[in-house]
């Protein structure tokens, strides 16, 4: 959304980058002229954050809040560009696409991975769950491609009901929703993992070796 | 500390139920696979059932199969087995285990709890 | 399914000797995903080592593991007299899990 507007409002920051953001602060202001190994310098802020306590914590998730409500402040007033609105109407009341197995199988570990490595960007994030899919024999994949084609069965069931309904009015004008709905920020979060997900599914490449015995 | 605690193991007779449980703590549960795994007396051990973190998939030996359901429930931190239409050959202790994601190695596991199916 | 045989059955050593348990599969473990637990009488097994020579948290360097494909080995370098238990490998690179039959180690 707007990626190239120089208007729209800056994201929101969590605790945790803030927390990173006064890190590197501290590390230039110590080191100067040393240069910064980013991959060691977020590893060793992940695992100081892990034992800060929750006091310790409480500024920056002060810095959050504060932030949180600059951004839907700014948001409020900001206008995005001309054909910049998001997509075409899309009516809440139409089945969901089903999720794939890899998707299943991401939104059963993410949390963990979140939780253990604050942070991992999105995008490292699905990198690691496309890893552990990788490192998933074929016959331990079943159980996920099971669930997969359970939903996608009832999927296709419910797609051919709601066509059969006909569409709602709007859909057929096409009336383009000006305004994003308000969403929940882990929604969101999850539609970008989906994303990231479905392009790590596109790549991965499945073990060869492995044989097909159900559990 | 990470802890797995099992109860409601027992006596039963053949064709019965039991219902077992295994309450964690120590740990973010809700992050875990979680098994169960069997030993009979004086035997080897045996996995018996596998559930992912959300619940939403399992599965079971194929001696099992049809018998015993997994099931967890994050917001008690507690994974349970029901064990139903028993036979004598399921006399064992019952360990729930820890695992990582898919089969893995079991990090930590509970005391036990034995079930005797008998008549 | 994969099968997993331990040998030997039952090993008898004294403290301060080396201990070698091996563990043989039907077909080759996929990616060496295998483990090692050791169990006392009354209690529950405990995780030694994975991904066949990784060793778990807390678990004393006197244990090592090794070995690749099909044949696998359990070292313990000098035994403690609290190392006197059975020892089980488990195969996790297939579905379903397989535990060998175990391996007793007693007092010589």
């Known amino acids: 959304m707007g990626k190239g507007d120089p208007k729209k409002p800056r994201g929101k920051m969590s605790s945790y980058a803030f927390f990173v953001q006064t890190c590197r602060e501290e590390h230039k202001k110590k080191h100067p002229d040393a240069s910064v190994n980013f991959s060691e310098f977020s590893k060793k802020c992940s695992e100081r954050w892990k034992t800060m306590s929750a006091k310790e914590k409480g500024k920056f998730e002060d810095m959050a809040k504060a932030d949180k409500a600059r951004y839907e402040r700014e948001m409020k007033t900001y206008i995005p560009p001309k054909g910049e609105t998001k997509k075409k109407f899309k009516d809440p009341n139409a089945p969901k696409r089903p999720p794939s197995a890899f998707f299943l199988f991401c939104s059963e570990y993410r949390p963990k991975i979140k939780g253990e490595h604050p942070g991992l960007s999105i995008g490292d994030v699905a990198k690691k769950l496309g890893e552990m899919w990788n490192n998933t024999a074929a016959d331990d994949k079943q159980p996920y491609e099971k669930k997969a084609a359970k939903l996608k069965e009832k999927y296709e069931k419910d797609i051919a009901a709601y066509r059969a309904k006909g569409k709602p009015d709007a859909a057929k004008k096409g009336v383009v929703k000006a305004e994003k709905s308000k969403k929940k920020k882990e929604e969101e979060e999850d539609e970008e993992d989906e994303e990231d997900e479905e392009e790590e599914e596109d790549e991965e490449d499945e073990d060869e070796e492995e044989d097909d015995d159900d559990e | 500390e990470v802890q797995l605690l099992e109860s409601g193991g027992g006596l039963v007779q053949p064709g019965g139920s039991l219902r077992l449980s295994c309450a964690a703590s120590g740990f973010t549960f809700s992050w875990y696979d979680m098994w169960w795994v069997r030993q009979a007396p004086g035997k080897g051990l045996e996995w018996v059932s596998?559930?992912?973190?959300?619940?939403?998939?399992?599965a079971y030996a194929d001696s099992v199969k049809g018998r015993f359901t997994i099931s967890r429930d994050n917001s008690k931190n507690t994974l349970y087995l029901q064990m139903n239409s028993l036979r004598a050959e399921d006399t064992a202790t019952y360990y729930c285990?820890?695992?990582?994601?898919?089969?893995?190695?079991?990090?930590?596991w509970g005391q036990g709890t034995l079930v005797t199916v008998s008549s | 399914d994969i099968q997993m045989t331990q040998s030997p059955g039952t090993l008898s050593l004294s403290p301060g000797e080396r201990a070698t348990l091996s563990c043989r599969a039907t077909?080759?473990?996929?990616?060496?995903?295998l483990a090692w637990y050791q169990q006392k009488p009354g209690q529950a097994p405990r995780l030694l080592i994975y991904d066949a020579s990784s060793r778990a948290t807390g678990i004393p360097d006197r244990f090592s593991g090794s070995g690749s494909g099909t044949d696998f080995t359990l070292t313990i370098s000098r035994l403690e007299p609290e190392d006197f238990a059975v020892y089980y490998c488990?195969?996790?690179?297939?579905?379903?899990?397989?535990f060998g039959q175990g391996t007793r180690l007693e007092i010589k």
């Open positions: 488990q195969q996790y690179g297939n579905s379903p899990i397989i």
């Open positions: 596998w559930i992912v973190p959300s619940g939403g998939i399992t």
């Open positions: 077909q080759s473990v996929r990616k060496n995903f």
């Open positions: 285990a820890r695992g990582n994601y898919g089969p893995s190695p079991f990090d930590y």
